[in-house]
C-alpha cells in the first residue's frame, strides 16, 4: 500500500487483510460513487479471518491470524487506521487470540465475539472502550462460534451461525447489554459458517457461508418483529469467508472462497428490487477479509 495521505472523500468501503496463498496486509477502499479503488497503508502484520468496524471515523482491524510460509499465528491484536493520516496504530490487545472473529459496535464500544485460538473455539466475548483503550470480558455466548456473523440492531448484538468445533451451525443468539446476557433466537433455515451478516432496514441478513458440505449463495433475513427468517434472492456466486457491509441502503459482499477459487467479485443487493448485481472486482481474489464503511 501507499504511504501518502489518503484523499479526503465521503463514504468508502474499506477491505483489510484477507487470504490468498497466505495472509495479506492490504488495505484498500472502494468508492461506490465512482467505482474506483484506493490503495492505502498496509496492515503492520498480515492477517486473515479478521473483522473490521468503524468507531468515531476510525477503522479498526480486530483479531484474525497470520498464516504465512513462516508459520501460523492467531492474533489478539486490535489496530486502528486513521483515514485522515493514512496510518495504522496499535491499540490494546484482546484477552485471547481470535481467528475467524465477529465484531459489532454498540454505543461506540467494540464487541469481539467468538473466534478460535488453535483448536480452542471461543464462546467468550469482550468489549473494547476506545476512550480508555481497554478490553473487558462480558457474558459468554451460549455456543462456541468461529466464523460467526455478528450484527447490531436496536442496540442488541446478534451472533449468527458459525462453527463450534464439531458442527456448523444454523443457531443464532442475541446479547442484551443492559442485562449482560445472551438468549437464543430463531435458528436460520440454513446451516451457515463463514457467512456475511449485516443489518439493513430493521432486518438481519445472512449471506452465503458454508454448510459443512458446500459453499452457499442463498441469503436469508431475520425480522426481529416476527422473529422469522425468510429467504431473499440468492447471490450470483457461492461464497464463504466473505466480507459484507451496508452502504447507502444496499448490501455489498466482497470476495470469499467458493470451494475452488478465491473470489475477487463484489456483489450488491438492492432490497427494493430483491436483486444482486456485480458492481466491481477487488484488485485480487481473497477470502477472510475485514470490511467496514467510513462514517459520513
Amino acid at each position: 500500500g501507499s504511504m501518502g495521505h489518503a484523499p479526503k472523500v465521503g463514504r468508502l468501503i474499506y477491505t483489510a487483510g484477507g487470504y490468498f496463498r497466505q495472509s495479506l496486509s492490504y488495505l484498500e477502499a472502494y468508492n461506490p460513487s465512482d467505482g474506483t479503488w484506493l490503495d492505502l497503508a498496509d496492515l503492520q502484520v498480515p492477517r486473515s479471518g479478521l473483522a473490521g468496524c468503524v468507531v468515531g471515523g476510525l477503522l479498526y482491524a480486530v483479531g484474525g491470524r497470520n498464516n504465512s510460509p513462516d508459520g501460523n499465528t492467531d492474533s489478539s491484536a486490535l489496530d486502528c487506521y486513521n483515514p485522515m493520516t493514512n496510518q495504522w496504530s496499535p491499540c490494546a490487545p484482546m484477552s485471547v487470540p481470535r481467528n475467524r472473529i465477529g465484531v459489532g459496535v454498540i454505543d461506540g464500544h467494540i464487541y469481539a465475539v467468538g473466534g478460535s485460538h488453535g483448536c480452542i473455539h471461543h464462546n467468550s466475548v469482550e468489549r473494547y472502550e476506545p476512550e480508555r483503550d481497554e478490553w473487558h470480558l462480558v457474558a459468554p455466548m451460549l455456543t462456541r462460534r468461529i466464523g460467526v456473523g455478528v450484527a447490531v440492531l436496536n442496540r442488541l448484538l446478534y451472533a449468527v451461525g458459525g462453527f463450534d468445533g464439531t458442527n456448523r451451525l444454523n443457531s443464532a443468539e442475541c446479547y442484551y447489554p443492559e442485562r449482560n446476557e445472551w438468549r437464543m433466537i430463531t435458528a436460520m433455515n440454513t446451516i451457515r459458517s463463514g457467512a456475511g451478516v449485516c443489518v439493513l432496514h430493521n432486518c438481519i441478513y445472512a449471506a452465503g457461508g458454508y454448510d459443512g458440505q458446500d459453499q452457499l449463495n442463498s441469503v436469508e433475513r431475520y425480522d426481529v418483529e416476527t422473529e422469522t427468517w425468510t429467504f431473499v434472492a440468492p447471490m450470483k456466486h457461492r461464497r464463504s469467508a466473505l466480507g459484507i457491509t451496508v452502504h447507502q441502503g444496499r448490501i455489498y459482499v466482497l470476495g470469499g472462497y467458493d470451494g475452488h477459487t478465491f473470489l475477487d467479485s463484489v456483489e450488491c443487493y438492492d432490497p427494493d428490487t430483491d436483486t444482486w448485481s456485480e458492481v466491481t472486482r477487488m484488485t485480487s481474489g481473497r477470502s477472510g477479509v475485514g470490511v467496514a464503511v467510513t462514517m459520513e
Epitope: Y19, R21, S48, G49, N67, G71, N72, R100, G118, C119, I120, G147, F163, G165, T166, S193, G194, Y210, G212, Q213, D214, S240, A241, Y257, G259, F262, S287, G288
Partner: antibody, heavy 119, light 107 residues
Framework: EVQLVESGGGLVQPGGSLRLSCAAS????????IHWVRQAPGKGLEWVAS????????LYAKSVAGRFTISADTSKNTAYLQMNSLRAEDTAVYYC????????????WGQGTLVTVSS | DIQMTQSPSSLSASVGDRVTITCRAS??????VAWYQQKPGKAPKLLIY???SLYSGVPSRFSGSRSGTDFTLTISSLQPEDFATYYC?????????FGQGTKVEIK
Amino acid sequence: EVQLVESGGGLVQPGGSLRLSCAASGFAISASSIHWVRQAPGKGLEWVASIDPETGETLYAKSVAGRFTISADTSKNTAYLQMNSLRAEDTAVYYCVAPRVDLYAADAWGQGTLVTVSS
Amino acid sequence: DIQMTQSPSSLSASVGDRVTITCRASQSVSSAVAWYQQKPGKAPKLLIYSASSLYSGVPSRFSGSRSGTDFTLTISSLQPEDFATYYCQQSYSFPSTFGQGTKVEIK
C-alpha cells in the same frame, strides 16, 4: 465405503517436481479438511500440509513451505499435492488423510504413494 | 513446535498382557490428542481421538486417558492382531506433530 486413493508417486531427481493426487469416494472432500502426511522409510509420521474447505486456507510444515502446494477440486472430489524443488529428504510414502469424525484426528487414510527422490 | 515424546520406543509383551504406552507433550495440548495403530506396509488406523474417545469399530480393549500433558494408550488384554507400531498425535497447535512411535512386539 469411504476410500482415499493416492497416485502420482514415483522416482524423481533432486530439484524435480511431482504432483500427487488423492481421489475420494464414499464422502465429499468439500465436507472435510484434507491433509497430507508422509513417512520416510523406516521412520515415523510427519504432517505435511492441509487445506480448509470453508476458507480455502492452506497450512504447511516448515520443511515443505514454499515448495509444496496443496489444492482441492471439489468437482472431481480430488485433492492434490504439487511438490517442487524436491530433495532427497522428501523421500517417503505420502498419505492423503481426512478428519471426518473429529476435527483433530484422521479417521480416513489412503493407502499411500511412494515418492523417491534420487539421482 | 510442540514435541510429543513417546515411550517406550519398543516393548515386548505376550498375548493377554496389559500394555501401556505414554506420550508427553512439551506444553499444554488440551485433549487434542489422537492415537493410531500401524502395521508394516499399511496406512495408520485411528484408535482414539480427543485423548479418550474410542473410534467407531475399535475394540473396547483399547482406551486412552489424559493427565495434564501426559497421554496414555492402554491395551487391556493384548491380542495377536495388536502387534504393531503405535503413534500419538497432537493437533492442538500448528503444526500438528506425532510421537516417534512405539513398536509392540511378541515376547
